[in-house]
């Protein structure tokens, strides 16, 4: 049960989180005029990935897109990339923990295989949420190196007679929104992980008879793992997760008294 | 067809108040600020300040913070400016302009401040 | 807040001559942002509200005629009719749209001689 709703838990915050990655991705106000110097300012600048744009003393906003590929700085490029990585790797990962869900019945999908999809949906939100945190970093970087940078040539004279303030940028919502998405994605990735560790099938015991050809010893071998003589269904050695989180329905590992003969 | 429809002339006492309105249509009325704008006998112009019918936010000119009050009624896609404490001053007529680059403009109304 | 300064006040033309009015402004009105000049220039003709003619320093709104052209950047901007018609006589301000208040020049008369 608790494994269930730690699963479930995890893909609906990795869910919400993608959403975010993708609206952050999507707004246009990465970074936004800095008002402190020019607070009487009608017209207002902002940007985003895709598009800058203005908005004027009558209240409309015009945007222009970036149309060219080359002439964008390289970081901007980097922190595209970066975001639209890391929504790729979220919608993958959606899709594959849709069907990883321990609620969710698909054909005879065994626990391992579910284990497993849990664990790759974990591993690519958290790769997910990582990339939007760096992309939006990167810009929010980019935006603190140009902000003092403008500051230190705050006033440009106009043939000595004139002052214009140049226009700075500071941290759009846009920002926040990203920083906020990608830690929800990679929490619900480590939720995932951690729900794949109860979902793991473990060695079932054989508690009243031990089956094996005349002849042969079964042995129990230390170190987690059981030793197998080839015949019945065992043939796999397998890890027993000791100390790890156990639901109810989950039948105990430790060896007992009837394990061997 | 864009039009900005202001009601007609006010004649008022000192330290009176008035309240006159600007009716849009033909455009989307929330995409726009609506701004006014009064204009001496004579003389140039001078912008009061502006609301936004969207969410109601305005902006004044500090010289007539006090003076002049701007409300909206979205459903009926009316602007108004109420103007308190009237002086021989305040005698002239009040224009409301709005969409991009206050390209449209009312017909003006003339308030009349006399004893 | 900005100071629009026009000049000449008053000019007397003739029918088809080409005339320049002028406009400067206290501060630069071009936005870094989209590398646009912030300033409206007006055509007031007696009884009727102000109406367009050039926005953002030169872009000429639909219906203006050709005749009209807006120049400039930064502080100082320059209204040229071509060739003036009888139409044309009113006032003509210049406005900052750049920064709040919103603030307009004094205007220039423009009469037949």
């Known amino acids: 049960m608790a494994v269930t709703a730690c699963q479930g838990l995890g893909f609906v915050v990795s869910l919400i989180g993608i959403a975010g990655i993708i609206a952050a991705t999507c707004m246009d106000q990465w970074s936004t005029q800095d008002l402190y110097n020019n607070p009487v300012t009608a017209v207002f600048n902002y940007q985003g990935l895709w598009r800058s744009c203005v908005r004027e003393s009558s209240g409309f906003t015009e945007c222009r897109g970036y149309f060219t590929l080359l002439g964008l700085p390289a970081m901007l490029q980097a922190v595209r990339a970066l975001m639209i990585v890391g929504i790729v790797l979220g919608a993958i990962g959606l899709l594959v923990s849709i069907f990883a869900l321990k609620c969710i019945r698909i054909g005879s999908m065994e626990d391992s295989a579910k284990a497993n999809m849990t664990l790759t949906s974990g591993i690519m939100f958290i790769v997910s949420g990582l990339c939007a945190i760096a992309g939006v970093s990167v810009f929010a970087n980019m935006l603190v190196t140009n902000f003092w940078m403008s500051t230190a040539n705050m006033y440009t004279g106009m043939g000595g007679m004139v002052q214009t303030v140049q226009t700075r940028y500071t941290f759009g919502a846009a920002l926040f929104v990203g920083w906020v998405a990608g830690g929800l994605t990679l929490i619900g990735g480590v939720m995932m992980c951690i729900a794949c560790r109860g979902l793991a099938p473990e060695e079932t015991n054989y508690k009243a008879v031990s089956y094996h050809a005349s002849g042969h010893s079964v042995a129990y071998k230390p170190g987690g793992f059981k030793a197998s003589t080839g015949f019945g269904s065992n043939t796999k050695n397998k890890k027993i997760y000791d100390g790890g989180a156990r639901t109810e329905d989950e039948v105990q590992s430790y060896p007992s008294k009837h394990d061997y003969v | 067809e864009i039009q900005l429809q202001q009601s007609g002339p006010e004649l008022m006492k000192p330290g009176a108040s008035v309240k006159m309105s600007c009716k849009a249509s033909?455009?989307?009325?929330?995409?726009?600020?609506i701004h006014w704008v009064k204009q001496s006998h004579g003389k140039s112009l001078e912008w009061i300040g502006y609301?936004?019918?969207?969410?109601?936010?305005?902006r004044y000119n500090q010289k007539f913070e006090g003076k002049a009050t701007l409300t909206v009624d979205k459903s009926s896609t009316t602007a108004y400016m109420h103007l308190s404490s009237l002086t021989s001053e305040d005698s002239t007529v009040y224009y409301c302009?709005?969409?991009?680059?206050?390209?449209?403009w009312g017909q003006g109304t003339l308030v009349t401040v006399s004893a | 807040d900005i100071v629009m300064t026009q000049s000449p006040s008053s000019l007397t033309v003739t029918a088809g001559e080409k005339v320049t009015m002028t406009c400067k402004s206290s501060?630069?009105?071009?936005?870094?942002?989209?590398?646009?000049?912030?300033l409206t220039w007006y055509q007031q003709k007696p009884g009727q509200p102000p109406k367009v003619l050039i926005s953002?320093?030169?872009t000429r709104q639909s219906g203006v005629p050709d005749r009209f052209t807006g120049s400039g950047s930064g502080t100082d901007f320059t209204l040229t009719i071509s060739s003036v018609q009888a139409e044309d006589l009113a006032v003509y301000y210049c406005?900052?749209?750049?920064?709040?208040?919103?603030?307009f020049g004094a205007g220039t008369k423009l009469e037949l001689k």
């Open positions: 302009a709005s969409l991009r680059f206050l390209a449209y």
């Open positions: 033909g455009y989307s009325f929330t995409s726009y600020y």
């Open positions: 609301i936004d019918p969207f969410n109601g936010g305005t």
């Open positions: 501060q630069s009105l071009l936005n870094s942002g989209n590398q646009k000049n912030y």
């Open positions: 953002r320093a030169s």
């Open positions: 406005q900052n749209d750049y920064s709040y208040p919103l603030t």
